[in-house]
């Protein structure tokens, strides 16, 4: 017997569907109507034939009452080839729901997204997460998707993007966006970051995550942020192969005074990088390759410093005397 494609937990809270059959019975998903968190994985199916069975241009207001009754707050859709028209149809319907967080992963969006009709309502998401989503429209995809969203988006995460740079002139500002996560785009680099951080389009950013994005130096990131007018409070540069030294010919970059938390863990650093902000609330340098203790002018003034997992702290590596330089905590690095 083939397993049921959809499973709803005992609390009617989380429902997960894995449609792996070539001809799936999509009606199975109806058992998820009572769930708050819904995940639908389409097994890599091409949803093009779906367009023949649904009227993507139908007025979604006819479904408004039904959709409003849904409990779903978090929706994940993954592993499919989706025509842009179908995606738009879904977004139009979901605009009447109470959906707050949408995650799209391992999707190939084909075709172009039509413009938002005048009478249409945007989707009032607080969080949008995209992982390994490719768009036929190249760099203009964010601008096209944005028009289907209300301007209250707070969290935007874009990982494994095929085109992490955006067509900035087409993108409107994200006035409420406080968290931008561009992690896991190893080809981004500092120049790509400058292109992705469309100047003045992200005025409210407080948290910027750039894990595993091909960043090279904290100073280079500083320059990209300054050019874009982005002033995060928290910056995550962990899991990049960072160089500690700055190119002497490169101009010095003044970090924004707003920055108070900097994560430089797992960055392969052999010394504390030059050109860090003078004062930080949090600095994470854990799991690097620091093989000697920092001297007083090598560290900024930090309230909360993490250095665990560096060779100079590891027990058994010639400490000058007991108690010094050893936190006693050896994290798994």
């Amino acid at each position: 017997t083939t397993p049921e494609p959809c499973e709803l937990d005992d609390e009617d809270f989380r429902c997960v569907c894995n449609f792996s059959e070539p001809q799936p019975d999509w009606s199975e998903a109806f058992q998820c109507v009572s769930a708050v968190e819904v995940e639908i994985h389409a097994g890599g199916l091409n949803l093009e034939p779906f367009l023949k069975r649904v009227d993507a241009d139908a007025d979604p207001r006819q479904y408004a009452d039904t959709v409003k009754a849904l409990r779903v707050r978090r929706l994940t859709v993954g592993a499919a080839q989706v025509p842009a028209q179908l995606l738009v149809g879904a977004l139009r319907v979901l605009a009447y729901s109470r959906l707050k967080e949408l995650t799209l992963e391992d999707l190939k969006i084909t075709g172009t997204m039509p413009p938002l009709p005048l009478e249409a309502t945007g989707l009032a998401l607080s969080s949008l997460r995209l992982r390994n989503v490719s768009w036929a429209t190249g760099r203009s995809w964010l601008a096209e998707l944005q028009q289907w969203l209300k301007p209250g988006l707070k969290v935007l995460s874009i990982a494994q993007a095929h085109s992490p740079a955006f067509s900035c002139e087409q993108v409107r500002a994200f006035p409420a966006l406080t968290s931008l996560d561009l992690s896991d785009n190893p080809g981004l680099g500092e120049r790509g970051l400058m292109a992705a951080l469309c100047p003045h389009k992200f005025p409210a950013i407080q948290n910027l995550a750039l894990r595993n994005t091909g960043m090279e130096t904290p100073t280079g990131v500083c320059a990209a942020l300054a050019a874009a007018g982005v002033q995060p409070h928290s910056l995550d540069l962990s899991h990049n192969s960072l160089r500690a030294t700055v190119n002497p010919s490169a101009p010095r970059c003044m970090w924004s005074s707003a920055l108070n938390s900097l994560n430089l863990s797992f960055a392969g650093l052999e010394q504390v990088p030059k050109g860090l902000p003078a004062k930080l609330r949090v600095l994470d340098l854990s799991c690097n390759r620091l093989n000697r203790a920092p001297q007083p002018d090598e560290l900024p003034e930090v309230d909360n410093l993490t250095l665990d997992g560096n060779p100079f702290l590891v027990p058994g590596t010639a400490l000058p005397h007991e108690g010094s330089m050893n936190s006693g905590v050896v994290p798994a690095c």
């Epitope: 090598e298 930090v302 909360n304 993490t306 250095l307």
Partner: antibody
Framework: QVQLVQSGHEVKQPGASVKVSCKAS????????MNWVKQAPGQGLEWMGW????????TYADDFKQRFVFSMDTSASTAYLQISSLKAEDMAMYYC??????????????????WGQGTSVTVSS | EIVMTQSPATLSVSPGERATLSCKAS??????VDWYQQKPGQAPRLLIY???NRYTGIPARFSGSGSGTEFTLTISSLQSEDFAVYYC??????????FGQGTKVEIK
């Protein structure tokens, strides 16, 4: 074992210069910052500043920004304090002291774990 | 600049008695206070680092406490070799660092 050995007692005239040395042994000289501390006769300890032994960059306390120079010779594992245009108020015992880094669950700082025996500088005409 | 104020200037104690030395910082220094002992004609010697950590080889009768702006060095039972001058020093993360003016512990 860790040792800081300073040069001997100096007697100088006002206006002259003096150079005090501090030779480190028993550890890697460039792994620890070196500080200088002044103690005038019958007085307390006064932190003068320090030198980054990786870069050679000195940092001076406000009262020691003129006439005082910290330097080092990595190959000789030696730090130096030079005082120019000596004045009567420079008459004191000068100590070098090694800074060791302390870290434990988010808290960090430095303390002076090893001190030289001190070099007495007398300024007299 | 952070000012460290030690009290009393002189403490007269009989051998075997307890001695309590105080050190006040003019602003919050967290736990970044170290204590040093200096005997006549000798270099200072580290006793306590980061407010309460006894340095290697320092007898258990020496203990430190406090955080923020108020710090204490306690010698639980004074031995003849403990009569000396004691200095607190704030080493608040980054320089400049400053010493207190010292407390002389003398035989009563």
């Amino acid at each position: 074992q860790v040792q800081l050995v300073q040069s001997g007692h100096e007697v100088k005239q006002p206006g002259a210069s003096v150079k005090v040395s501090c030779k480190a042994s028993g550890y890697s000289f460039t792994d620890y910052a070196m500080n200088w501390v002044k103690q005038a006769p019958g007085q307390g300890l006064e932190w003068m500043g320090w030198i980054n032994t990786q870069t050679g960059k000195p940092t001076y306390a406000d009262d020691f920004k003129q006439r005082f120079v910290f330097s080092m010779d990595t190959s000789a594992s030696t730090a130096y304090l030079q005082i120019s245009s000596l004045k009567a108020e420079d008459m004191a015992m000068y100590y070098c002291a090694r800074s060791t880094f302390y870290y434990s669950s988010y808290i960090y700082g430095w303390y002076f774990d090893f001190w030289g025996q001190g070099t007495s500088v007398t300024v007299s005409s | 600049e952070i000012v460290m104020t030690q009290s009393p200037a002189t403490l007269s104690v009989s051998p075997g008695e307890r001695a309590t030395l105080s050190c006040k910082a003019s602003q919050n220094v967290g736990s970044n206070v170290d204590w040093y002992q200096q005997k006549p004609g000798q270099a200072p010697r580290l006793l306590i680092y980061k407010a309460s950590n006894r340095y290697t080889g320092i007898p258990a009768r020496f203990s430190g406490s406090g955080s923020g702006t108020e710090f204490t060095l306690t010698i639980s039972s004074l031995q003849s070799e403990d009569f000396a001058v004691y200095y607190c020093m704030q080493s608040n993360t980054n320089p400049p660092w400053t010493f207190g003016q010292g407390t002389k512990v003398e035989i009563k």
